[in-house]
Structures are given as C-alpha cells and as structure tokens.
C-alpha cells in the first residue's frame, strides 16, 4: 500500500470506558492532528476507516460492524459501542484516505470493570469546590451526544456507595449536583448514573468524579513568609555552616503558580561565587493551601558571606513578598586571663 502519514499511538488520549455501557469515541485525527473537520474531509471524497489491535496481540484487524444489534457501529467520525464488552480493550486506529491522501492515528481504549460501589481502575477527573463559598454545582460529565434532546433520561447521583437523597447540603438537580455550602466533609467520589432508552433497550452511563474542597478566593492572601523573620538572627563564626530556612504559606488559588526563590545581594545564588545549596520541600493543608520551605545552606561560611544580604522572595497570583534574613558574624567572647595572687600570711 502507498505511504500513509502515521501519527503513531496517541497515548495522551488514554480512553477508559465502563464495561456494558455505551461509548462514543471520536476519531482524534480531526480533534488534534488535522486542520480540517470530518465534514470537510467527507465532502472532499475522503473515507474514514476504522480497525483495531486486540490487547496483547500484534495483528491489526478490521472492526466487525455486523455484530448483532449493531453493537459496534460508525457514525461520521464517531465509533459507537452499544454497549462495550471487556474484550473490546485494545488499540484502535482511524485512517482517513482516498487514492492520493492518507493519514492515520491509533489510540488505546480500555474497557474497565466497576463494582457495585462504582470502584474501578478508572482515572477520575477532579472537580474543585471552594470552601464555604455559596452554591456551587458539578455537572455529570461526558454525556453529550449519547441521546437526542427529545429523550429525557433519569439521573441518579451517589456519594461513594450511597444514593444522594435528603443530604444536608447536597441537592441533586437532574444533570447537576448542587452544593449549598461546600465543606471538607463533602470531599469524596460522586457518581451520576444516567439511564436512557434507545430502540427498545435501556442503557446506563456511569460517570464518577472526585470532589475536592479547596480554599476560597474570598480568603486568599498574598504569600506569607514565616521565616526568615525579625525574631531570628543567624549568628555564625567563619567556617561554620549557615542554614537559613525560607518558609512560605500560599493560600490556595486556582491555576496560580506559587514561586519561592532566594537572592544573595539581589542576585541569583548561582551567580555568586560561593558554594550554596538550596533544598525545597512542599506540604499541603486539607484545603490545598501550600507551605513551601527552601533551605539555603552554605557549608563553610566566610566573614565576607556574613556581610551579604540573604533575601527570600515569594510570589503567587495574589502578589509578591520578600524578607531578608538577619545574618551577622558572631563576636568572639573576650578571653579573660585570671591571675591568682597567693598571699602568705604570717601569724
């Protein structure tokens, strides 16, 4: 066969679907690789061909579109499973071609089993809710295109294993789940089960997502430098090790980049001719506020080093702050010569 532009196996789009549920999978060529859509390609006389490689096999084979009840079908640039089976797992390829043009891409599809409490190896999307922020909603994800707008599905929401009804601050509202006032106790996995009829059959779509309650923007502040501070003086003798921790608290801020850095005499530590090492550790609170600690260390400090200014800087979307460490050379204690005068007393 003639040459085909092969985009390889697109592992970025690791598609996971539940067993015994409908799945609609769009050919990734039009979404991520080509500059035109399916309609344009179709009008230009290009044909979309699907085939697959079963799990643990090397042989590419055509997809059987003649299964009972049209279990697998293709519609435009979508491959449909109504429903999936466990052994549908494999690498799927969509190829767009005519006599002069060819382009193809493969992607992995994994059919996943779930237990009665919706536990599974499925990678779950995370939805962040602000703590005590007023009404916030999550929406049952990835259900568009499964049924026409004329069909009114039934939607049941679960938290973990439990059906959500008569919960204090969580109210199911069709495709949405409303949190009246999100609290830490609302952290967990939430599942919507969408049930709809199609051609005399009933299908279920199960979608689970993780809700994580995070710090509210109402409470967000610029970074707070806890150390260095005015109360601690780093008093060292030449030759000793100088260790200065910079500890910074960052409020949780959606999509904010938290940065901490040291300067020595205003410069990047790498640009100074001293042997400096900086080690960083990061910890998070339950609401994803972050504490970063960067420890600056100079193994054998010189008297020149003790005259420099060591400043810790921090920045987030809320602002920038800086704090200088109080570093000084230890004044050696004076050495007293004690003279003992011995008096001989005559009696």
């Amino acid at each position: 066969s003639e040459r085909c532009d092969d985009w390889g196996l697109d592992t970025m789009r690791q598609i996971q679907v539940f067993e015994d549920e409908p799945a609609r999978i769009k050919c990734p060529l039009f979404e991520h690789f080509l500059k035109f859509n399916y309609s344009t390609a179709h009008s230009a006389g290009l044909t979309l061909i699907w085939y697959w490689t079963r799990q643990d096999r090397d042989l590419e084979e055509p997809i059987n579109f003649r299964l009972p009840e049209n279990r697998i079908s293709k519609e435009k640039d979508v491959l449909w499973f109504r429903p999936t089976l466990l052994n549908d797992t494999g690498n799927y390829t969509c190829m767009l071609r005519n006599t002069t043009y060819c382009s193809k891409v493969a992607f992995p599809l994994e059919v996943v089993q779930k237990d009665s409490c919706f536990n599974s190896p499925m990678k779950l999307p995370v939805h962040k809710l602000y703590i005590e922020y007023g009404i916030q909603r999550i929406t049952c994800p990835n259900v568009d295109g499964y049924f026409p707008s004329s069909v009114k599905p039934t939607i049941t929401w679960y938290m973990g294993c439990y059906k959500i009804q008569n919960f204090n601050n969580v109210i199911p509202e069709g495709m949405n789940l409303s949190f009246l006032i999100a609290l830490i106790s609302n952290n967990g996995n939430y599942t919507c089960v969408v049930t709809y009829p199609e051609n005399g059959r009933t299908f279920h779509l199960t979608r689970t997502l993780t809700v994580k309650v995070v710090g509210s923007p109402k409470n967000a502040v610029p970074p707070v430098i806890h150390s260095p501070n005015d109360h601690v003086v780093y008093e060292k003798e030449p030759g000793e090790e100088l260790l200065i921790p910079c500890t910074v608290y960052f409020s949780f801020l959606m999509d904010s980049r938290n940065e901490v850095w040291w300067t020595i005499d205003g410069k990047k530590p790498d640009d100074i001719t001293i042997d400096v090492t900086i080690n960083e550790s990061i910890s998070h609170s339950r609401t994803e506020d972050e504490t970063r600690t960067q420890i600056l260390s100079i193994k054998k400090v010189t008297s020149e080093d003790l005259k420099r200014s060591y400043v810790c800087h921090a920045r987030s979307a809320k602002g920038e702050v800086a704090k200088a460490a109080k570093v000084k050379q230890k004044v050696p204690a004076p050495r007293y010569t004690v003279e003992l005068a011995c008096g001989f007393g005559a009696t």
Partner: antibody, heavy 118, light 112 residues
C-alpha cells in the same frame, strides 16, 4: 550594562520612541524601569516591564506611553508629547533577580535627553 | 496614585555628624518593605543605597542605614563625609498594580 538612546528635540504632538539596550544579563531574569527627570526637578516614575514581559505604566502615563521589549532592548513609545515631557529619560535594571517590581534598581543608563519645544 | 513625602530640603549637618531623612507613604508599600533609597549627584543617574527598606545594596558603606515598615521609613547617614552631599530619594512599590510605583520628592543633604 544599560544604555538609552533616541532622545532628541521634537515639536509638541510628535511621537517618539526611546530605546534601552541591555547587555550582560537577560531581560527574562530582571524587571526594567523607565524614570524621567525634568531639569532641576526630582525623579518621576514612568513605568516598568517585569521579567515575564508584562508592562505597566503610571496612571498619568497610561494611553500616551507604552513599554515593550525584545530580547535585548526595552522601548518606551511616547505619543502626544508636550513641553511638560521635556526631561532626561533613564532606563534601569532591577537590583533584585526575578522580582516583579524594579523599585530598587542598581544598573542605570546615563539617560537620554528629550526636549519638546515649538 | 501613591504619594511618598520626604523630609523638606535642605538638611544640613557637619562632617562626622548624623542626618536622618524621613519618607512617609500615603499607603503601605508592597509587603510593608518594598521601599528603596537612592543617592543622586548632579549630572549623574541615581545610585541605589538601600532596598527592602533596610537591606544594604552591594558596595554601599554601612554608614547608611534604612529602617521602617508599612508607611513610615527613614534613612540615617552617620559619620557624614563631604562626599555624602547629594539629593536622596525614597522609592516604593505598591501591590495594587504596577502603575502605582512612586518616588519621593527628594531631600538635599548639605555637609558643612
């Protein structure tokens, strides 16, 4: 080093672009500030550009002055110049590596003189 | 816009003496400490002395001391030398946005 250029005698209303050429450091590491000084007067802040490339201008300069940069130059574009804009224009580098604000600047050019006169 | 008000000019003192220049901000500077002090002599660009309210810039003698926080700052020059005769400026950065940086009006120091 930092060096300003582009200052000259112009008539009111004329646009003018001043260029600050830097060497020995990266503009991705340091913020740059523009400051001016009218004859016999104090220093006046015009605006700055942060290491990330975002530029800010003083409220009085907004709309008339814009700051932009390339990899080795920082430009100050001025429009609708008036006699009040007569000054020596300085460009300076922030003293502090990677800081947003160049309020503390250690590397200054000698300045370029802009005279607006009819 | 933010305003930095400095001690009125001129301030004079004898060689070997001490001078203090105050700088008051109409609003707290960023982080309460984003304030710098400069020295400027005629025909020269400013020279950075102090940054972060009290940190000495490289190569600046320890006779220059910055202090203060929030809205009130001071520059103290001790053991005055004739070479210290110059105009001194404070400069602040404000967190509201970049358009709100400012210089003080300057204070001339005369050394007798």
């Amino acid at each position: 080093s930092v060096e300003e250029s582009g200052g000259r005698l112009v008539t009111p209303g004329t646009p003018l672009t001043l260029t600050c050429t830097v060497s020995g450091f990266s503009l991705n590491d340091y913020a740059m500030i523009w400051v001016r000084q009218a004859p016999g007067e104090g220093l006046e802040y015009i605006g700055f550009i942060e290491p990330g490339g975002r530029a800010y201008c003083a409220s009085w300069a907004k709309g008339r002055f814009t700051i932009s940069r390339t990899s080795t130059t920082v430009d100050l574009k001025m429009t609708s110049l008036t006699t009040e804009d007569t000054a020596t224009y300085f460009c300076a580098r922030s003293y502090v590596f990677y800081s947003t604000y160049p309020y503390a600047s250690d590397l200054w050019g000698q300045g370029t003189l802009v005279t607006v006169s009819s | 816009a933010q305003v930095l008000t400095q001690t009125a000019s001129p301030v004079s003192a004898a060689v070997g003496g001490t001078v203090t220049i105050n700088c008051q901000s109409s609003q707290s500077v960023n982080g309460n400490n984003y304030l710098a002090w400069y020295q400027q002599k005629p025909g020269q660009p400013p020279k950075l002395l102090i940054w972060l309210a009290s940190s000495l810039a490289s190569g600046v003698p320890s006779r220059f001391k910055g202090s203060g926080s929030g809205t009130q700052f001071a520059l103290t020059i001790s053991d005055l030398e004739s070479d210290d005769a110059a105009t001194y400026y404070c400069a602040g950065a404000y967190s509201t946005s970049g358009e709100e940086n400012a210089f003080g009006g300057g204070t001339e120091v005369v050394v007798k």
